[in-house]
Interface confidence: low
Amino acid sequence: DACGPPPTFEAMELTSKPKPYYKVGEQVEYDCKKGYHHFAPFLTHSICDRNHTWLPISDEPCVKKVCHYIPNPLHGEAILANGSYSFGNQLHFICNDGYYLIGKEILYCELKGSDAVWSGRPPICQKIVCKPPPKINNGKHTFSDVEVFEYLDAVTYSCDPAPGPDPFSLIGESTIYCRDNSLWSDDAPECKVVKCRFPVIENGKQIAGFGKKFYYKATVIFERDKGFHIIGSDTIVCNSNSTWDPPVPKCAK
């Protein structure tokens, strides 16, 4: 002629210690657990009815506490890990292309005392900008009148005509772009006269890359004479400091 222990709930707990059995008509009260709050008008009690079962509480009257709404950052997005602002959840921040995040990428909805609060301040998305790329001696770059460059903006360098008989060579990347760290993708190139010496080889001969003069990136290929072998590389390139790389090879018996 009695009910067993009352039902348990995820979000509620009994206000009194449960007993092994209860008389018909006896009532138990529930309170919201820590981190949950009462959502009227649902009941928070249950009664042992004459069928020796507990009068059901149709819906849990307690709901998880939630952190305050955080809007998308300007030029970015705030993404909830599972669609609700309740405690235990995470809010992920990402910035649009061309912007970078200042602050923490993830905020956590945490319980502080009995309140649900975010673990920190929301970050901000700051525009990625590069200062104008360096000016170079004996050359110029496109968009030289622009003062601020945005993410992925590119400039191209070119060398001026040389005053003397030898042309300026462009050393480095001719096109550089504004990267996501507000720096240019490469150092500015250099414009200078690069001229390597005539590549003399004993007991061998040049077979490709012939020229009157050997400027930057000129490539020369050698072949050994019969009965000799090459010490070093048979292919050399004129590098930016006007020397051959690797050095001109030797031929030995």
């Epitope: 200042i102 602050g103 923490k104 920190g120 301040r121 970050p123 900008v129 760290n181 507000s182």
Partner: antibody
Framework: EVQLVESGGGLVKPGGSLKLSCAAS????????MYWVRQTPEKRLEWVAT????????YYPDSVKGRFTISRDNAKNNLYLQMSSLKSEDTAMYYC???????????????WGQGTLVTVSA | DIQMTQTTSSLSASLGDRVTISCSAS??????LNWYQQKPDGTVKLLIY???SLHSGVPSRFSGSGSGTDYSLTINNLEPEDIATYYC?????????FGGGTKLEIK
């Protein structure tokens, strides 16, 4: 209590190198962005380097880029500044600095060490 | 780079006075401005971040205001321990830069 103790300063010739260290205590070092800020003999403050909590993001001003390297050892609670190709204009008091309490990484230089003096002179 | 200018390099005031220290930026910095205090012994403290937010442990007699390019730090009811040099700093754009400082002395 947040404590930042710098060491490694001294007299060095132009073109020389020096490595500064900062021993951090009183907080979870690996949770915070860290910075080096220097003060010139004329009392001007200059930001020198930034490193993110995990060491992924590193920033420098142009004045030291390519010459200075900031790094950290989260296991040892240490911050470092490797300085090379030193110039007379690098002469300064170098401060190790931690960001603010509020679980952010804004450049709010909240906690400063007592500094270590670097003198670059022939 | 954004230049930060503190036009007054030194300032004399009497105890109990209200003191205002100014700082201007070479371009708008959207309130991304901090104030620091450096005592004569070299110790540096953050006073105010984001133009007007008081850092923890800083007395409420300190306040900050401003917008665009012009910012100020106000100290109400000047006390002996406020004798120091005060620096502004912008974090609107890399590289982060400081003003030249304003040295506050007692008359």
């Amino acid at each position: 209590e947040v404590q930042l103790v710098e060491s490694g300063g001294g007299l060095v010739k132009p073109g020389g190198s020096l490595k500064l260290s900062c021993a951090a205590s009183g907080f979870t070092f690996s949770d915070y962005y860290m910075y080096w800020v220097r003060q010139t003999p004329e009392k001007r403050l200059e930001w020198v380097a930034t490193i993110s909590d995990g060491g992924t993001y590193i920033y420098y001003p142009d004045s030291v880029k390519g010459r200075f390297t900031i790094s950290r050892d989260n296991a040892k609670n240490n911050l470092y500044l490797q300085m090379s190709s030193l110039k007379s204009e690098d002469t300064a008091m170098y401060y190790c600095v931690r960001d603010i309490d509020y679980d952010t990484s804004y450049p709010w230089f909240a906690y400063w060490g007592q500094g270590t003096l670097v003198t670059v002179s022939a | 780079d954004i230049q930060m200018t503190q036009t007054t390099s030194s300032l004399s005031a009497s105890l109990g006075d209200r003191v205002t220290i100014s700082c201007s930026a070479s371009q708008g910095i959207s309130n991304y401005l901090n104030w620091y205090q450096q005592k004569p012994d070299g110790t540096v403290k953050l006073l105010i971040y984001y133009t007007s937010s008081l850092h923890s442990g800083v007395p409420s007699r300190f306040s900050g205001s401003g917008s665009g390019t012009d910012y100020s730090l106000t100290i109400n009811n000047l006390e002996p321990e406020d004798i120091a040099t005060y620096y502004c700093q912008q974090y609107s754009k890399l590289p982060w830069t400081f003003g030249g400082g304003t040295k506050l002395e007692i008359k």
